[in-house]
Structures are given as structure tokens and as C-alpha cells.
């Protein structure tokens, strides 16, 4: 008799999820000498242990603690780049500026980037059919809780000047409900972080507006200032040129406004 399976509103676990996580772990530890000591089989076991046989709407940060412990990594705390709704450009940036790091440049972020996963209560099966959607089903699902946990830890580790890349093409440039707005902003440590600098990325070629004056940016400034952290904002009018100048800063065109 086929067993009844809960139907969730979100897409199911990414196909070949165990193999993907294990392969990514092996690749990452080969590329990053400081993580060569990591046993990828243990990492997978800890990852699996966080959600297998558990109700996918009842996942806690505690469930991920064994994985967090195995994936402990020291990133230079003054070289952290946060982002919201503009992941691709943030990743292009850290590929060029190799001494800065997004969450996805760390082992745990790299393992889970763009993947979906969930299990089922009381069975050791991975659910490849559907997983809970954050809005339509529940917020305490395996994927959301994972990103909340790693994002909180990443923000807590930051120091000195923290940069955040924001999407100037969105109606809410700063969104209080994003991971950045709901988790990272509130977990920056004022005793360690002096300044948060927002880089607002423009989408249109002819867009010369000062998006640092946007009401949502003013809201971000207010939240940050109340936390005793200085706030700074910079318009990036031409993201293509920005990346080029980060790559080749001495280029003669890199003195003008970008």
C-alpha cells in the first residue's frame, strides 16, 4: 500500500542532493587548504541528521549545531560582504576581490547554495516531491532555518567595516523581511562593527538618481544608527564598470563616478 505523503507548496529536494553536498564538500576542502582537515562524510552525516526523520515544519537551529561545529571556519572578520536580492553580482565581486567573502564563499554557504532539501517525520527518506514553502506552509523548514542559522553566525563574526550590496532595481531596496533585513542587520555586533556601508546597485543605464536617499535606505540607516553603528551609502551607477575597476583599479577610467 503506497504510504500517504504530505504535499507541500514548495519544490522538493534538489535531485542528487546527498551526492551534490558531498561533492561540493570535497571540492571546497581541496581548494581551501585551511579546511583540508574537514571530513566530508561526517559533514554529510551531520547535515542529514539535521532534517532526516524530522517534521519539516519543526526544524530548529539546534538541529543544525553538529553541522555548524564541523563547518566552523575563520573568515577575516573585516572582509565580509553581505548582499540582498543581488547574489550574482556579489559573487562576481568576491571572485575578483579575492580577499572578501560572502556567506556562499564559506564552506557551509557553498554546500547549500541554490539547493532545497527536506525530510519526513519518522521516516529516513528524503522528500524529492515537495518541501514546505516559507510563506505558504511554514517558516521553520529545513532550508529557511539553515540560512537563518548560518546568516546569524556570519553577521555575528563581522567586524570593523561591513559592506552590503543591495539591489537598486527592487521596489524595496532594503527589505526588512529579507535575510539581511531580518537576521544579519540585527546580529552585527556594535562593539566590533564600526561602519556598515551599503552599495546600491543601479540597473538602468540612464538611471542617475541618488538611491541612497530612498526611504527604505533611510529606514536601514535608522536601524543601524540606533544600534550604534555608523552608516554609509554609495550608489554604484555602473556595476559592470565597478567590477572592472575592482579588477584593474589603476585603469584611467576608474577615477570618475561609477
Amino acid at each position: 500500500v503506497p504510504r500517504w505523503r504530505q504535499q507541500w507548496s514548495g519544490p522538493g529536494t534538489t535531485k542528487r542532493f546527498p551526492e551534490t553536498v558531498l561533492a561540493r564538500c570535497v571540492k571546497y576542502t581541496e581548494i581551501h587548504p585551511e579546511m583540508r582537515h574537514v571530513d566530508c562524510q561526517s559533514v554529510w552525516d551531520a547535515f542529514k541528521g539535521a532534517f532526516i526523520s524530522k517534521h519539516p515544519c519543526n526544524i530548529t537551529e539546534e538541529d543544525y549545531q553538529p553541522l555548524m561545529k564541523l563547518g566552523t571556519q575563520t573568515v577575516p572578520c573585516n572582509k565580509i560582504l553581505l548582499w540582498s536580492r543581488i547574489k550574482d553580482l556579489a559573487h562576481q565581486f568576491t571572485q575578483v576581490q579575492r580577499d572578501m567573502f560572502t556567506l556562499e564563499d564559506t564552506l557551509l554557504g557553498y554546500l547549500a547554495d541554490d539547493l532545497t532539501w527536506c525530510g519526513e517525520f519518522n521516516t529516513s527518506k528524503i522528500n524529492y516531491q515537495s518541501c514546505p514553502d516559507w510563506r505558504k506552509d511554514c517558516s521553520n523548514n529545513p532550508v529557511s532555518v539553515f540560512w537563518k542559522t548560518v546568516s546569524r553566525r556570519f553577521a555575528e563574526a563581522a567586524c570593523d567595516v561591513v559592506h552590503v550590496m543591495l539591489n537598486g532595481s527592487r521596489s524595496k531596496i532594503f527589505d526588512k523581511n529579507s535575510t539581511f533585513g531580518s537576521v544579519e542587520v540585527h546580529n552585527l555586533q556594535p562593539e566590533k562593527v564600526q561602519t556598515l556601508e551599503a552599495w546600491v546597485i543601479h540597473g538602468g543605464r540612464e538611471d542617475s538618481r541618488d538611491l541612497c536617499q530612498d526611504p527604505t535606505i533611510k529606514e536601514l540607516e535608522s536601524i543601524i544608527s540606533k544600534r550604534n553603528i555608523q552608516f554609509s551609502c554609495k550608489n554604484i551607477y555602473r556595476p559592470d564598470k565597478f567590477l572592472q575597476c575592482v579588477k584593474n583599479p589603476e585603469d584611467s577610467s576608474c577615477t570618475s563616478e561609477i
Epitope: 573585516n78 580577499d99 570593523d160 567595516v161 556601508e197 583599479p249 576608474c254
Partner: nanobody, 126 residues
Amino acid sequence: EVQLLESGGGLVQAGDSLRLSCVASGRTSSFYTMAWFRQAPGKEREFVASVGWSGGSTLYADSVKGRSTISRDNANAKNMLYLQVDRLKVEDTAVYYCATRRGVSSSRLVSEYDYWGQGTQVTVSS
């Protein structure tokens, strides 16, 4: 090659203010982070303040935080760096160095800066 030239040092009274300047020339860029360090006699060179490429992301050592302002001017391909220090103390006596590093992140580490000026002497008397 980047050349850095500091100016503005001298003998000042405790409690007074001082403004140091640094001009960067050669193959420099507004996409460099710029910083001030200082070295007192018999001591290690220490971080004072830095400013990122945008001019907005500033960072200060605890020893000068709240009484100093770092700023930069990237206009006309002329990269200028400034440091205003108020309420000077005898402990601020040192040679002040301008430094720059490739990259947009600030750093307190001497080893992360690529180019250095010759320094300008600041002596604070009581």
C-alpha cells in the same frame, strides 16, 4: 609605482588640533583603501584610521576614535588623504605615515598595505 607624501606635522600643544595631509601620485586609484598609521619611538607601527574607496566607510583605532576624522578627496584624479585629530595628547607623539592598499576593504594590519609614505613627525608637548 605609487608615491605618497605626507605633510602637516610639527610641534603642537596638548589639547590643540592638527590636520595631516597626504597626496598620492603615480599609478594610484580611487579604488585603493587609504590609511594613517603611526609609530612612536621604540614602539611598533600602529593603525590610526582608514577610509575605503567610497570615502564613506571609515574605521578608527580606539586610541583616536571620537576625536579624529579621516577623509579623502578623489577629485581630478588627485588622491588626497586627510587626518584631523582634535584634543591632542602627549601620547599622540609619533611619526604619522600615509599608506594605501589595493582593494576596497579596510584593514588594521600593517602587512596588508602595499605603499607607504616617508612619514611626518608630530610632537605633542604638555
